[in-house]
Interface confidence: medium
Amino acid sequence: AITEAREEAKPYPLFPGPLPGSLQTDHTSLLSLPHTSGYQPALMFSPTQPGRPYTGNVAIPRVTSAGSKLLPPLAFKHTVGHIILSEHKDVKFNCSISVPNIYQDTTISWWKDGKELLGAHHAITQFYPDDEVTAIIASFSITSVQRSDNGSYICKMKINNEEIVSDPIYIEVQGLPHFTKQPESMNVTRNTAFNLTCQAVGPPEPVNIFWVQNSSRVNEQPEKSPSVLTVPGLTEMAVFSCEAHNDKGLTVSKGVQINIKAIPSPPTEVSIHNSTAHSILISWVPGFDGYSPFRNCSVQVKEVDPLSNGSVMIFNTSASPHMYQIKQLQALANYSIGVSCMNEIGWSAVSPWILASTTEGAPSVAPLNVTVFLNESRDNVDIRWMKPLTKRQAGELVGYRISHVWQSAGISKELLEEVGQNNSRAQISVQVHNATCTVRIAAVTKGGVGPFSDPVKIFIPAHGWVDHAPSSTPAPGNADPVLII
C-alpha cells in the first residue's frame, strides 16, 4: 500500500514512485495540504501505478488584501488540442489554471469521454503559489498508449461548488490496422457463389484491403475497408485471408477454410442394444457429415430367410440421437440391418450390414375347446382343453395359465394356476359354493403369455346338488354360456 509521509516540518506529503505490487487506490479520502505563504513551488505526486488521478483537496491560503478586489472569471488556459501518436508510445499533456488564493478547497480530476478517470495513469499536480494566486498545472501521462486510450480528455476543477471544465485534448493513437470484422470459415455448395467480409480500422485512415486465396492475391487493386469479396464458386477447398494496409503498415487476418459440401460418409459401428420378439434397438456412429448437417437417417432391414422374398423394410428417423427401435418384426427371425444418413447434398452409402435376431414370441392363439364341469364328490372343477396350433415363431410351449374367477353375492376373486405343457386337463378346488366360476386358459412359451380363451362359466351350487353336465367354450358369436346345476 502507498502510505502518506506526514511530518510537521514538511508542508506537502511526498509520495514515492511506483511500488511493485502496490495496486490499491484511494478514491474517497481527499488529502488536505497545509500551505504557508511564500513557500516556493513544490511538487505533489499522486500514487502512480495504482492510480486514479489525484484529486487533492488543496487548502489555498486566504489573502485578505484580495478580499475586496473584483476577481476575474476562472478558466483553464488553452493548451494543445490534438495529439497524434503511435501505439505503445508514451504521452504527456497538461492543463493549467491560476486560482486566486482567496479560494479554498479546490479539487482537480481528469475525465475521458465523459467518464471520470479512476486510474491506470500517472497524474501529477504542481502548485506554484504567489502572493495573490496559485498557478496549478495538472499533468497527465500515459505509458505505452493503446487504441483504447483514444478519446477526449478534460480537466475538471471544483471550486466553491462551481465546476470549471478545460478544453478537450484529443488523443489519437495511430497504429497498424485493427480488424473489426474478419472473414469466417464457411461450408459452401460446389460451384455456388458466396461472400466474405473483411473490415479494419485505423487510425490512421484510410485502411485498404487485399484479399488472398491459397497464398495468392485475388484483387490487383486494393479496396477501401470494409470490403466484401464475392467468390463465384469453388470446386475444392480453399483458404482465404485478407490484408489490411494503412500508413503504419500491414496486418493480416486469420486464414479461413472454405469447405465444399459433399454427401456424408456412411455410418459406422452399428450395434444391437436390445432384442425382443418384435423389436430390435440399434445404435450407430455417424460418419463424417460432409460439411453439411445431417438431416435424417434411414434404417434398412432385410429378413435373412431362404423362404423370404428378400424385400427391404425402410424406417426413416431423425439424425439424432443415433439410435432407433425397429418395430413390427417377426418373432424368432434373423435380420440384416444397415443405416444410411443424409445431408442437404444427399444420402450416404449404407453402413456395413450387421446380423440381428428377434427372440421367440408369445403364442398368438388361445387353447381350443375349453370345457368345465363340476366334480361334486371331490368338491373340485375339472377343466379340459385342446393344445393350440402355435406358429414356430412363438417358440416352444412351456405350459398353460388358468384364470378362474369366483363370484357370489358381493364378492369376486381371481386365482391363477400354472400347469405344464404336457397337460390338457386340470382340476381346481371349489373356492365358494352358491357362486359362479369363470374359467379362461392361455398358452405360455418362453416368449410370454398368449391370449386367454373366451371365458367359460359354471355355477357351483350349495352342497347336495348333483349335476355333471359340462360348460364349454362357446362357438364364435355366441353369448357366454352359463351352466346352472
Epitope: 495496486l23 490499491q24 487506490t25 478514491h27 501505478q49 495504482p50 486514479r52 475521458k112 469521454d113 465523459g114 467518464k115 471520470e116 478517470l117 479512476l118 486510474g119 491506470a120 495513469h121 500515459i142 493503446q146 483504447s148 486510450d149
Partner: antibody
Framework: EVQLVESGGGLVQPGGSLRLSCAAS????????MNWVRQAPGKGLEWVSY????????FYADSVKGRFTISRDNAKNSLYLQMNSLRDEDTAVYYC????????????????WGQGTLVTVSS | AIQLTQSPSSLSASVGDRVTITCRSS??????LAWYQQKPGKAPKLLIY???SLESGVPSRFSGSGSGTDFTLTISSLQPEDFATYYC????????FGQGTRLEIK
Amino acid sequence: EVQLVESGGGLVQPGGSLRLSCAASGFTFSSYSMNWVRQAPGKGLEWVSYIISGSDTIFYADSVKGRFTISRDNAKNSLYLQMNSLRDEDTAVYYCARDETVVRGVINYFDYWGQGTLVTVSS
Amino acid sequence: AIQLTQSPSSLSASVGDRVTITCRSSQGISSALAWYQQKPGKAPKLLIYDASSLESGVPSRFSGSGSGTDFTLTISSLQPEDFATYYCQQFISYPTFGQGTRLEIK
C-alpha cells in the same frame, strides 16, 4: 455461451481468510476487465473490486481496501479474490461479473454475472 | 461517492400493467446508467445500458430513458416472468447501485 462459475465460499470466523475463484468460459477472458460484486443477505448490490484485462490496473471499494486482493490468471481463464481479516459485514453472496469494455481507468456496466458463492463470516 | 436513489422501493402490479421505476443520481452522470433485473436466488441480469440501450436478448417491452440525474425504467406490458427486483447502476465513476425496487404481483 458465456459462463462464469464462482467457488470457494463458505463459513469462516471473523479475522479469518478465504479465497474465491471464478472460472470463465465461452469468451476470450484475456480481453475483458473483471469485477467482484457482493450482496449481503436481503440487501442490495455493492461493487467490491475491479481488475483490467492485463492486471495492471486494479481498484477496490473503500470497505475492503487493504484486506482484499483481486487477481487473475488469463492462462487458466480464472479470476480470484483473496479475502483476509474478514468481518461480520463481509457476509454476502459474491458474484464475479464481466465488464462490458476495456478502457484503462474506466469501470463500465456488467454484462455477464456468475451465479454467486456465499461467504458467511460468523463466530 | 455518487448516490443513486430508486423509487418506489416496492411496487405491486398485475400482468399486462405498464410499470415505471425511477432512479435519481446525487450528481449529473450524463447517460452512464445501467438497469439490472434480479430474481430470488439468481444473479442480476443486464437489461439496459447507456441509460436507454436495450441489451441483446432482452424483450422490447423493457425500455430506459433519462440523462443527467433522473432516469426511468419502463416495462410496457408486465409479464409473469417480470416480477423481480430491479437495480440501477451508475458507471461514470466508481460503480454504485440503487437500493433496488421490488416488483410484486398484485
